[in-house]
Amino acid sequence: LSVQQGPNLLQVRQGSQATLVCQVDQATAWERLRVKWTKDGAILCQPYITNGSLSLGVCGPQGRLSWQAPSHLTLQLDPVSLNHSGAYVCWAAVEIPELEEAEGNITRLFVDPDDPTQNRNRIASFPG
């Protein structure tokens, strides 16, 4: 089981939408896949996929989940608020037929406020 997550870095304006994608691949078929999105280490949602469908469509505040066969799990945040800023990780585990788990790399989401002066001050505070 392998999980690839993207993008690595996402910068969006407050009130717009952000899309995080997790690609889940396994050489053999699976009957049930448990998936999990975390933000800054806290679980946003932990649904499973079976018979081609997600057991849950929501994921955290303003978050919508979708599964597109063969391998794409998408988390869409809409509308994005300042509180959505953080480090997101996608995790997946095949529960049936045999336990296999893997997680993606971090997606760092930065949300720019509507006020351009706040935006300038905020960006200046980031190193590099």
Epitope: S2, Q26, A27, A29, E31, L33, I49, A69, S71
Partner: antibody
Framework: QVQLQESGPGLVKPSQTLSLTCTVS??????????WSWIRQHPGKGLEWIGY???????YYNPSLKSRVTISVDTSKNQFSLKLSSVTAADTAVYYC????????????WGQGTLVTVSS | DIVMTQSPDSLAVSLGERATINCKSS????????????LAWYQQKPGQPPKLLIY???TRESGVPDRFSGSGSGTDFTLTISSLQAEDVAVYYC?????????FGQGTRLEIK
Amino acid sequence: QVQLQESGPGLVKPSQTLSLTCTVSGFSITTGGYYWSWIRQHPGKGLEWIGYIYTSGRTYYNPSLKSRVTISVDTSKNQFSLKLSSVTAADTAVYYCADMADKGGWFAYWGQGTLVTVSS
Amino acid sequence: DIVMTQSPDSLAVSLGERATINCKSSQSLFSSNTKRNYLAWYQQKPGQPPKLLIYHASTRESGVPDRFSGSGSGTDFTLTISSLQAEDVAVYYCQQHYETPLTFGQGTRLEIK
């Protein structure tokens, strides 16, 4: 371009352990999401999957051979190996190493194969 | 274990004619989760390792001539060579990767009539 090459003795005595090594070139064996596999073909017969080792080190073996098979990886040499214990004449075959990806499930790259004969 | 059964065991076809090889699995190889069939086809010539031709039942591997095509879903699959060439003489195998143990068909020997 991924290349695989099997090596090891072509003759093994009954009851001994068959040991083969597959050297991978053009690709790092530590790359995530790959299964390093062994498949055999008895003379004039079809293909039999022996087992594979995943990037994580987890192994999967054919239940028909599981009690006798060990597959391992040597990342420093970019190699993986097969050991088959307590061999009999029925283990005489051409042994292939091959690779398989999580994004696939099919064997895209194969070694040329090596004939191992079990005989006293 | 999933049993893969090919038919016929051997086949003789004239150059330029169509060759059809069938493969039947003992259980469905289609996943409703990924919407894929977990089936591949290989060609093996004497003294050589098998060569991947088709995956996902119908997707041609890069570099494989377009006279080779795969079709089918669930338990019944077909490999078709639309116009047989001399270099197509070989043994053809289907393989399932729906589950472990991975299993192959017994092979179909294709010859020129």
